[in-house]
Interface confidence: low
């Protein structure tokens, strides 16, 4: 990941965290952790679509995208989009939806994030080739079974000792501002409004920001281009790594990187990627969760906005523009039309939505066929040419036919999987995003 992407990741996470609705009284500020980033990068290099079984007490979010680059904003959007399926008061995820990526992103006690991305000519567990895999690890891990991601209340009213309030987040006294140095895109302080999820799908091309986190920004990753490891950005937005892993791949922390993979794979925790079916010409990305490993399956894939992406890519959720940073390779972040315009089939994941499990076995591997990469394509509102593949445990999602498909990996956490992954892959670009 570039420095900008790292900062963006952290900033987006923090923006999302600061803007949770209902507001959080104990939300900690996230910061980048190089050790976590190195750990995430090392795993990403293995090119496995599934959660790291050796992640120990680390949360994990995965995101994968075909094309030449990672799309951090898109990944965040995908992860954060699951918010629409999560009920905080009941601590449940809507049936058939994923919420784990989202819950990891807004897990109050998680304060360190590290992400890494790697370009994989072949991603184990995925038929698609040339995929940029984003892995984000978190500490302390989120998605603890039986626990809510955060305590509702006045922002900062329950900050731990030694923390002060800043932008509605509890920040360690004397700590540097993590997002302060974001190059190019300095996300504005979260508005602390409940609108964080409402607009998450509509993402502009600007680099991913946490507040209105772009809907599934997917950066295109050229098949032959090895993408840089995505540093774990201290964003509080869930890292909805698109990955289709076999069961047990889900990690608790949502990955922070999104690549512009033509197709996006959504893990079971990508519940609401394309809540509204959307079709994109040429390709759409639908999260194809392969397995949900120890993660709340409630992650949803944020929609990407087609307007602001240059590179082709696909996104699962409604039309949204991609944010600048996340769309590195997703040059065709084309703005996506309203999610309603995206055609997406939803296939129930094998995991029961809302069901909390310490671990989730992804019994159904994504059966999606390899999605062709479509260079020069970008997520588009109407995917006329894209085909949709129904993947087990995948969430519905659509990307512009020109956009790479995106799949969010399962979000695995020490806790449980919230819900099955629903989704289908719209063929052209693939984006794997999922929580395992």
């Amino acid at each position: 990941l570039t420095d900008e992407e790292k900062r963006l990741m952290v900033e987006l996470h923090n923006l999302y965290r600061a803007q949770v609705s209902p507001t959080a009284s104990d939300m900690l500020h996230m910061r980048w952790d190089e050790e976590l980033a190195a750990f995430a990068k090392a795993y990403a290099r293995q090119c496995v679509w599934g959660h790291n079984k050796e992640r120990g007490r680390r949360g994990e979010n995965l995101f994968a995208i075909t094309d030449e680059g990672m799309d951090v904003p898109l990944a965040m959007e995908e992860w954060h989009h699951e918010r629409e399926h999560y009920n905080l008061s009941a601590a449940t995820c809507s049936p058939g939806q994923m919420c784990g990526h989202y819950t990891q992103v807004v897990w109050a006690k998680t304060e360190r994030i590290g992400c890494g991305s790697h370009f994989c000519e072949k991603l184990q567990g995925v038929e698609e080739t040339n995929i940029e895999l984003l892995v984000c690890n978190y500490e302390p891990p989120g998605n603890v079974k039986g626990k809510r991601p955060y305590q509702e209340g006045t922002p900062c009213s329950q900050c731990p000792s030694g923390y002060h309030c800043k932008n509605s987040l509890c920040e360690p006294i004397g700590s540097p501002e993590d997002a302060q140095d974001l190059p190019y895109l300095v996300t504005e302080a979260p508005s602390f409004r409940a609108t964080e999820a409402s607009d998450s799908r509509k993402m502009g091309t600007p680099s991913s920001l946490a507040t209105g986190i772009p809907a599934f920004l997917v950066t295109e990753v050229s098949g032959s281009l090895a993408t840089k490891a995505l540093p774990a950005v201290e964003t509080q937005a869930p890292t909805s790594l698109a990955t289709k892993d076999p069961p047990s791949m889900a990690t608790e922390a949502p990955p922070c990187v999104t690549t512009e993979v033509p197709s996006i794979l959504a893990a079971h925790s990508l519940p609401s990627l394309d809540e509204e079916p959307v079709t994109f010409p040429k390709s759409t990305h639908v999260p194809i969760p392969k397995s949900a490993d120890k993660v709340t399956d409630k992650t949803k894939v944020p929609s990407r906005s087609p307007e602001n992406s240059l590179d082709p890519k696909m996104s699962l959720t409604g039309a949204r523009e991609l944010l600048p940073h996340a769309q590195e390779e997703a040059e065709a972040e084309a703005e996506l039309p309203p999610s309603s315009e995206v055609l997406a089939s939803v296939f129930p994941a094998q995991d029961k939505p809302g069901e909390l499990q310490a671990t989730l076995d992804h019994t159904g591997h994504t059966s999606s066929k390899s999605l062709p990469n479509f260079p020069n394509t970008s997520a588009t509102a109407n995917a006329t040419g894209g085909r949709a593949l129904a993947l087990q445990s995948s969430l519905p999602g659509a990307e512009g036919p020109d956009k790479p498909s995106v799949v969010s990996g399962l979000n695995s956490g020490p806790g449980h999987v919230w819900g099955p992954l629903l989704g289908l892959l719209l063929l052209p670009p693939l984006v794997l995003a999922g929580i395992f």
Epitope: T2, E4, L15, Y16, D67, E68, G69, M70, D71, L185, E188, S191, R193, T195, K202, G204, T205, P206, S207, A210, T211, I213, P214, E220, V221, S222, S224, L225, A226, E260, P306, E307, N308, L310, D311, P312, A319, R320, E321, L322, L323, P324, Q327, E328, E329, E331, A332, E333, A334, E335, L336, P338, P375, N376, T377, A379, T380, N382, G400, K403
Partner: antibody, heavy 121, light 117 residues
């Protein structure tokens, strides 16, 4: 410090060709998408083309499609714009700009100083 | 593909607040786009200022003063660049732009020349 320096501009006759270069420094060139944006003196900005960090994806404005080719040599940290079948309306200052990531997203930041291309008989 | 329309000029006194609009053509919703804003002073290349998609999805360019902020006017289907506390050095041309993924092209607005009185 990120620096972008365009070169190769000049006077060319209609129907002629010209190749612009943009030497980049101060950042990992291959990690970023790069673009060309032009501006007719005294007029507005017009996006011309973008290429992803790895060079696998290229995008062009309809006005130049089929005539212009964008490429990059990541080993030389250089961006190129091959302009063929030039027309008078292609006369403009051509800027190269860095994107925020490897994907083309239209996040032009920063920009080079530009190089003037004049197409005239 | 969408068209971004900007007023050709805008004059305001130093210290005033300026609201520049970038109207999206009919058939497109500004909420679906990431509107970026660029500033260009005479003789200089453009400078990236910020982008805006929603209140929760926006960002400033590096070193861009907080006096510059973005927003959307849904009723007008336009992106907004607000410059508060206008200063003489803000006199420049301002361009909005956005990427249109359907056509895979980047679109610039026609630009607004801001004059500080």
């Amino acid at each position: 410090e990120v620096l972008l320096l365009e070169s190769g501009g000049g006077l060319v006759h209609p129907g002629g060709s010209l190749k612009l270069s943009c030497a980049a420094s101060g950042f990992t060139f291959s990690s970023y998408a790069m673009s060309w944006v032009r501006q007719v003196p005294g007029k507005g900005l017009e996006w011309v083309s973008t290429i992803s960090g790895g060079g696998g994806y290229t995008y062009f404005a309809d006005s130049v499609k089929g005539r212009f080719t964008i490429s990059r040599d990541n080993s030389k940290d250089t961006l190129y714009l091959q302009m063929n079948s030039l027309r008078a309306e292609d006369t403009a200052v051509y800027f190269c700009a860095k994107d925020l990531g490897s994907r083309a997203q239209g996040w032009f930041d920063p920009w080079g100083q530009g190089t003037l291309v004049t197409v005239s008989s | 593909q969408p068209v971004l329309t900007q007023p050709s000029s805008h004059s305001a006194s130093s210290g005033a607040s300026v609201r520049l609009t970038c109207m999206l053509s009919s058939g497109f919703s500004v909420g679906d786009f990431w509107i970026r804003w660029y500033q260009q002073k005479p003789g200089n290349p453009p400078r990236y200022l910020l982008y805006y998609h929603s209140d929760s999805n926006k960002g400033q360019g590096s070193g861009v003063p907080s006096r510059f902020s973005g927003s959307n006017d849904a009723s007008a289907n336009a992106g907004i660049l607000r410059i508060s506390g206008l200063q003489p050095e803000d006199e420049a041309d301002y361009y909005c732009g956005t990427w249109h993924s359907n056509s895979k092209t980047f679109i610039f607005g026609s630009g607004t020349k801001v004059t500080v009185l």
